[in-house]
């Protein structure tokens, strides 16, 4: 419905005018396009006005005082539906002695400039010119709601019209709609819905999975308390007013669950004692991942099957598994958790560490002089298999010869077969210091503790061997 209040609408003499005055202003209309500024030349400046009335000091030739200038009363309140057209106006009679006047439209305290449909019409007479400023909106929107006034400037004085209140009514408009949520199973939560008119009041119905929740409507705003859900649901709210109903967006309320296992695992890099892995997390179960667990077990069927567990933060989906044996095969699984619990472990994947340099030196190194052949015999025990960190390809022997003022170091490489070597005596009456390191394709391991033997001058016999004890034999 459209209504105007508090003033009745009288048919005016000019097309589109909404005015309360029956008396025609002029009989001969003279229309112009939109001209916010109108020029009249006063013979003498006016003085400040009170309210929307200007009381000019100028008097005519007959010295009659001029009436105060004011906009005529017009319609005070226009109610109409969205998308309808509306036209309203201000009218004023201005003595012809005034020039340099300006009429402008203002809405809610801000001047309306630019592309507005404002037209000013002039109706000149002998003594006064009637001015009608019309404002039209072809298809009103809610944003057109507000208080409109005309302002007219005469001699730096401002005359202000009574406000015209435009009230655009339509379907309810949501100012707050329910939001999607992830909730714990069987736990209460709230949804909020707020809508406004005009027209008011706005009543709210809640809808769950296409069925109404409340039989009686609630006045907007409305808060729905859901006692708990066991499965995903879609909620929306209906806002009703005299113009009809508007339905909010449907929001999905998800039930938090344990996450899905990772969808990918990548072996990024392997060393002798570590494997760098990354993974792509699976579906998070509507709850952020907290941390992840990397499970590692030896893939060797003869191993005891014990599982090593490495816990890490959920980000950055990357972890370096350390303290692994060299040249070993491992099965790796990844699982991640959220607030609800742990995902299943990903399918087990296979990864291997590379060959490394041995981590310990050969054991029980024994050195003795074989004087008859002028050689030094060296014997040792290979490092324990687990600490070889690969396949032994041989040994490196360092022997340093020291006598008065002379020192020279020699290196020998020997094959992996056996655990003995023979080196030629380099210097007599000198000390020979021997150290041995095991070698794999992964590199050279640490050297054993030095073992010293004195090489006497020719003819002096000493067969006593020198040795390093095996661990635990000291």
């Amino acid at each position: 419905r459209e209504e105007a209040k508090p003033y009745p609408l009288f048919p005016g003499p000019f097309p589109g005018s909404l005015q309360t005055d029956h008396t025609p202003l002029l009989s001969l209309p003279h229309a112009s396009g939109y001209q916010p500024a109108l020029m009249f030349s006063p013979t003498q400046p006016g003085r400040p006005h009170t309210g929307n009335v200007a009381i000019p000091q100028v008097t005519s030739v007959e010295s009659k005082p001029l009436p105060p200038l004011a906009f005529k009363h017009t319609v005070g309140h226009i109610i109409l539906s969205e998308h309808k057209g509306v036209k309203f106006n201000c009218s004023i009679s201005v003595p012809n002695i005034y020039q340099d006047t300006t009429i402008s439209w203002w809405k809610d305290g801000k001047e309306l400039l630019g592309a507005h449909h404002a037209i000013t019409q002039f109706y000149p007479d002998d003594e006064v010119t009637a001015i009608i400023a019309s404002f039209s909106i072809t298809s009103v929107q809610r944003s057109d709601n507000g208080s409109y006034i005309c302002k007219m400037k005469i001699n730096n004085e401002e005359i202000v019209s009574d406000p015209i209140y435009i009230e655009v009514q339509g379907l309810p408009h949501f100012t707050k709609q329910p939001e999607s949520m992830n909730v714990t199973r069987n736990t209460a939560f709230n949804l909020t819905c707020q809508a406004v008119g005009p027209p008011e009041p706005v009543n709210i119905f809640w809808v769950q999975n296409s069925s109404r929740v409340n039989e009686q409507p609630e006045k907007s705003p409305s808060v729905l308390t859901v006692p708990g859900l066991t499965e995903m649901a879609v909620f929306s709210c209906e806002a009703h007013n005299d113009k009809g109903l508007t339905v909010s967006k449907g929001v999905q309320i998800n039930i938090k669950a344990i996450p899905s296992p990772p969808t990918e695992v990548s072996i990024r890099n392997s060393t002798a004692h570590s494997i760098l892995i990354s993974w792509v997390p699976g579906f998070d179960g509507y709850s952020p991942f907290r941390n992840c667990s990397i499970q590692v077990k030896e893939a060797d069927p003869l191993s005891n099957g014990s599982v090593m567990i490495f816990n890490t933060s959920a980000l950055p989906h990357l972890y370096q598994i350390k303290q692994l044996q060299a040249l070993a095969n491992y099965s790796i699984g990844v699982s991640c958790m959220n607030e609800i619990g742990w995902s299943a472990v990903s399918p087990w994947i296979l990864a291997s560490t590379t060959e490394g340099a041995p981590s310990v030196a050969p054991l029980n190194v024994t050195v003795f002089l074989n004087e008859s052949s002028d050689n030094v015999d060296i014997r040792w025990m290979k490092p324990p298999t687990k600490q070889q960190d690969g396949e032994l390809v041989g040994y490196r022997i360092s022997h340093v010869w020291q006598s008065a003022g002379i020192s020279k170091e020699l290196l020998e490489e020997v094959g992996q077969n056996g655990s003995r070597a023979r080196i030629s005596v380099q210097v007599h009456n000198a000390t020979c210091t021997v150290r041995i390191a095991a070698v794999t394709r992964g590199g050279v391991g640490p050297f054993s503790d030095p073992v010293k033997i004195f090489i006497p001058a020719h003819g002096w016999v000493d067969y006593a061997p020198s040795s390093t004890p095996a661990p635990g034999n000291a």
């Epitope: 296992p261 990772p262 969808t263 990918e264 695992v265 990548s266 072996i267 990024r268 890099n269 392997s270 792509v280 997390p281 699976g282 579906f283 099965s331 990903s346 399918p347 087990w348 994947i349 296979l350």
Partner: antibody, heavy 128, light 111 residues
């Protein structure tokens, strides 16, 4: 609802090129590896190619050079570019989600664990 | 390239029968168990039935079961239902190779 929809199939002359698309809904290509599989009329299934969530690609040896897998994660769509088509490429082409995938970046290969969601397929006919 | 060989290629059976399909690999499947079984009906895409040789995919009836490790695998339907007449494929991956191999298929038809 999780869904895969293939498109782009049709009749093509030998030597021609075609690009198939696989539109994904209900999950993200940035979280799942995807694969193409084909099936010639009356024949069995034949794996073509895989693209991991990060964009690494691996193909069957017979497909390398002629078939290229790619994706646009912003459009949640995967593609198969097929060049130098032959009569024996006539088949229904399926896209499928890889349920789990292990990648061996240092050795440039990866292994599919399972294909857990399939599209309806699009028919490509290569004929003069 | 590794190959998966299914047998039989065709199998005639009646509703209620116990049906067994075998899948043999020319070399060990990755991790000895990364073998899957798929069911396909005419004009439809394949559907995952079993993965990890013996784990049932979501929504698959318990009358389907899988077993095996390494190179020998079996799919069993304990009591054939009218909806089970279809073609079944095994598939798996191998270490050191990106290829995902499919078996030749076994068509289960009504006797």
């Amino acid at each position: 609802e999780q869904q895969l929809v293939e498109s782009g199939g049709g009749l093509i002359q030998p030597g021609g090129s075609l690009r198939l698309s696989c539109a994904v809904s209900g999950f993200s290509l940035s979280s799942n590896a995807m694969s193409w599989v084909r099936q010639a009329p009356g024949k069995g299934l034949e794996w073509i190619s895989i693209i991991s969530s990060s964009g690494s690609t691996y193909s069957a040896s017979w497909a390398k050079g002629r078939f290229t897998i790619s994706k646009d994660s912003s459009k949640n769509t995967m593609y198969l570019q097929m060049n130098s088509l032959r009569a024996e490429d006539t088949a229904v082409y399926f896209c499928a989600r890889v349920g789990f995938f292990v990648g061996y970046g240092a050795y440039d290969y990866g292994i599919i664990h399972r294909l857990d969601l399939w599209g309806q397929g699009t028919l490509v006919t290569v004929s003069s | 390239d590794a190959q998966l060989t299914q047998s039989p290629s065709t199998l005639s059976a009646s509703v209620g029968d116990r049906v067994t399909i075998t899948c043999q690999s020319s070399k060990s499947i990755y991790n000895n168990n990364w073998l899957s079984w798929y069911q396909q009906k005419p004009g439809k895409p394949p559907k995952l039935l079993i993965y990890d040789a013996s784990d049932l995919a979501s929504g698959v009836p318990s009358r389907f079961s899988g077993s095996g490790s390494g190179t020998e695998f079996t799919l069993t339907i304990s009591s054939l239902q009218p909806d089970d007449f279809a073609t079944y494929y095994c598939a798996g991956g191998y270490s050191g190779d990106s290829d995902y191999a499919f078996g030749g298929g076994t068509k289960v038809e009504i006797k």
